[in-house]
């Protein structure tokens, strides 16, 4: 799988030349440039940055760089009518109000256009009522409240702490529980690491810091008004009542200073157990309502945000392949930020910029990759992955026929402890081999490989001597490529030590304090972790675009399919009586997995032996590898989620960020004991086993000898 074979090459034009050209100092400079003002989707500032990136990518040497624009539904606070939450007394007087903005960080006091904290796509409304504390607002939290504690959230305003699951799932759960409003807050237990100072003296969240974010439940639809199709000039748009994924109740985020004031008066039921307690000095009573002296006081929300169809701009750069120009390897990450984007997304965008510069340098010296590389700076990721999804909808026919791989490039860091990789099993061997060739940036691992430090710090739970690689979920721009189109995808970034840091994400995520200084002072002063991430992302793109045989190993898919089949079978076997009653069998699935394993093994043997100098046979074998991921796509999609079409992986129905294996079967089995019609419920389990077994068998057959 040599990388040294593209046309017009001299021996120096190989992976090493590409990697050696990547410089930490450039990434630092680019990050600074991208973070001096806010780049909120749909604003003039973000359009200007798009044009700057277009111009610079052209200078770097790409063959073409175009802007692709779409008119999508976005959401903004009302500038003259701010959002806030009050405690009101029995006369309706506001006796306490939450903040209207975050105190700006030092040096940024005079920056204009800092959007105040808000929950994007919240409807307008001024609900008032008693408060119920719902922990993280996960499915299991509402089960605990409703089933065990017999607490009814209907007509209540719920307050939930951020963390554990995607905020959109929290809102959906609250809606289903009958709540009339949702307050989201950051608890220090999740967003304040012990022993670290709050910003600007450290990387912890100050009391006035607030996490912004969208609260949609799009399930892969993209623009809520044009599901399935690009939001172009002649688009037919749904009415707002028919829009996909919009919340139906007002939602607003606050920091822990304000949360303290709401939670300290809570009465009603005590928390069910210690897992419901955060780190504030409050009782974490569930409610409903305030305690004795304050029982006549209520909470009132004032939400005046508006949804507006707004133009967004992707930047698409092309480096044409010399041998297979109709095969696309895509490197994409978003450009829009909530405020300054010090980590999210600009630590990723700066890395993409340096990767483009390095590829451009090689191209100027006469080199071209074997396959075409597409570079993308996506817009409106923060509003629901809109830019990437609209572009993929517009280009779906090309992508499904020509898409080899998609590598995502959002935040390069969420910590500085070790590498974190989520990818298709097809890329496991690529990632392993690449990281064995890269130097570890970690202290105490001088002269050792990245693979070694990564494996030591984040070992695989199944295979000793190997690092953990996770399933792809969603919440980022790979979603449409992987979950809808079935293009092999992966992502890599540096992460925290999950053992010692139990907070969710990084503390300053989506706050005004996510600045250049946060990264430069506290996370990566030498930009060595950024450089390592650039080497991993860039190295993957280089290999995928340049190796003669695609660096995919289908045997790794066979291994995980068996693991996932075992897991879903054991979940089902928690109901042995029902399985017997309704004749539920997993034989077809295990048989398909066995067939897949045998056929994949034979394919791999042929891959070692075939004549690589025969371009027709080479193309045939590569196409079988490229189309394997595509073979796991069910054109009908998952139940009630038509844009999640991958049968092996989907975002969890309970947490968009997490990946679930055999999601169709998993969802059919979930909480099956509570279903009113068990016969129908188990019938759906059987149908999902059938779909999964058929899909695995069909995918296996794409690897068989063609005739």
């Amino acid at each position: 799988k040599s990388s040294n074979e593209a046309t017009n090459i001299t021996p120096k034009h190989n992976m090493k030349a590409f990697l050696d050209e990547l410089k930490a100092e450039n990434i630092k400079k680019f990050l600074y440039n991208f973070t001096q003002i806010p780049h909120l989707a749909g604003t003039e500032q973000n359009f200007q940055l798009a044009k700057q990136i277009q111009s610079q990518w052209k200078e770097f040497g790409l063959d073409s760089v175009e802007l692709a624009h779409y008119d999508v539904l976005l959401s903004y606070p009302n500038k003259t009518h701010p959002n806030y939450i009050s405690i009101i007394n029995e006369d309706g007087n506001e006796i306490f109000n939450t903040s209207l903005f975050e105190p700006p960080p030092p040096g940024y006091e005079n920056v204009s256009d800092i959007v105040p904290p808000f929950s994007a796509f919240s409807p307008q409304g001024m609900p008032e009522g008693d408060l119920v504390y719902v922990n993280y607002a996960r499915t299991e939290d509402f089960f605990k409240l409703e089933r065990d504690m017999k607490i009814n959230c209907s007509g209540k305003i719920v307050i939930a702490r951020y963390g554990k699951v995607f905020r959109g799932n929290k809102v959906k759960n609250a809606q289903l529980a009958g709540a009339k409003g949702v307050i989201l807050y950051s608890d220090p237990a999740d967003y304040f690491a012990p022993g670290v100072k709050s910003y600007p003296d450290g990387w912890n969240l100050p009391g006035g810091g607030v996490q912004r974010g969208n609260i949609l439940n799009l399930n892969g639809a993209g623009d809520p008004l044009t599901p399935g199709y690009p939001a172009n000039e002649y688009a037919y748009r749904r009415g707002i009542a028919e829009a996909v994924g919009l919340p139906s109740i007002p939602v607003h985020p606050i920091g822990y200073y304000d949360a303290q004031k709401l939670l300290e008066k809570m009465g009603g039921s005590a928390p069910p157990d210690s897992s419901w307690r955060g780190s504030l000095k409050v009782p974490y009573n569930v409610g409903p309502g305030f305690t004795g002296n304050f029982s006549t006081q209520k909470v009132k929300m004032h939400i005046h945000s508006t949804n507006e169809v707004t133009r967004i701009y992707n930047v698409i750069g092309t480096l044409r392949g010399a041998v297979e120009p109709d095969r696309y390897v895509i490197l994409g990450g978003h450009r829009d930020s909530w405020v300054f984007g010090g980590i999210d997304p600009q630590s990723g965008a700066a890395v993409v910029h340096e990767i483009v510069r390095s590829f451009g340098t090689l191209k100027k010296e006469g080199w071209r990759p074997r396959r075409t590389i597409l570079f993308a700076s996506w817009d409106a990721e923060e509003f629901g992955l809109l830019g990437s999804t609209e572009w993929a909808e517009e280009n779906s026919r090309l992508l499904q026929e020509r898409g080899v791989a998609y590598i995502n490039a959002d935040s390069s860091i969420e910590g500085n402890y070790t590498l974190r990789v989520d990818c298709t099993p097809l890329m496991y061997s690529l990632v392993h081999n690449l990281t064995k060739e890269l130097k570890s940036p970690d202290e105490g691992f001088e002269g050792k490989s990245l693979y070694e430090s990564w494996t030591k710090k984040s070992p695989s739970p199944e295979f000793s001597g190997m690092p953990r690689i996770s399933k792809l979920g969603s919440g980022n721009d790979f979603e449409v490529f992987f979950q809808r189109l079935g293009i092999a995808s992966g992502r890599a970034r540096y992460t925290k030590n999950w053992e010692t840091n139990k907070f969710s994400g990084y503390p300053l995520y989506h706050s005004v304090y996510e600045t250049y200084e946060l990264v430069e002072k506290f996370y990566d002063p030498m930009f060595k972790y950024h450089l390592t991430v650039a080497q991993v992302r860039g190295g993957m793109v280089f290999e995928l675009a340049n190796s003669i045989v695609l660096p995919f190993d289908c045997r790794d898919y066979a291994v995980v399919l068996r693991k996932y089949a075992d897991k879903i079978y054991s979940i089902s076997m928690k109901h042995p009586q029902e399985m017997k009653t309704y004749s539920v069998s997993f034989d077809s699935l295990f048989s398909a997995v066995k067939n897949f394993t045998e056929i994949a093994s034979k394919f791999s043997e042929r891959l070692q032996d075939f004549d690589k100098s025969n371009p027709i046979v080479l193309r045939m074998m590569n196409d079988q590898l490229m189309f394997l991921e595509r073979a796991f796509i069910d054109p009908l999609g998952l139940p009630d989620r038509p844009f999640y079409r991958h049968v092996i992986y989907a975002p969890s129905s309970h947490n968009k960020y997490a990946g679930e294996s055999f999601p169709g079967i998993y969802d059919a089995l979930f909480d099956i004991e509570s279903k009113v019609d068990p016969s129908k419920a188990w019938g759906e389990v059987k149908r999902q086993i059938y779909v999964a077994a058929f899909t695995v068998q069909a995918a296996a057959e794409t690897l068989s000898e063609v005739a």
């Epitope: 109000n97 903040s99 709050s198 009391g207 006035g208 200073y257 004031k261 504030l280």
Partner: nanobody, 126 residues
Framework: EVQLLESGGGLVQSGDSLRLSCATS????????MSWFRQAPGKERELVSA????????FHADSVKGRFTISRDNSWKTLYLQMNSLRPEDTAVYFC???????????????????WGQGTQVTVSS
Amino acid sequence: EVQLLESGGGLVQSGDSLRLSCATSGRTFDVYAMSWFRQAPGKERELVSAIDWSGSNKFHADSVKGRFTISRDNSWKTLYLQMNSLRPEDTAVYFCAASTRLYGTTWYEFNDSDYWGQGTQVTVSS
């Protein structure tokens, strides 16, 4: 860790105005609320006005309501007390205080603030 320095006091006539300032330095991001207290000779220290970290909530004691206004600059570097229609009974040493505590029956009620300035004398003659 938070330093406070008051200024702007002085001798004025009844009915006049004064603007007190309190310059802050140190870890002002940890401050939850800032207050102006006053202590007249032979009397207990009393809370005059308070403002929370965000500026969304302000408190003024009944004795100064409609005459005194508390405010701060955007970067939390300076706290102000605009005092209009001053009366002889407003004569006192005015202290600036900062609290990093969140707890109290109401947001502005703190038994004891964490940080105090040295005070500035305000004298109102009739």
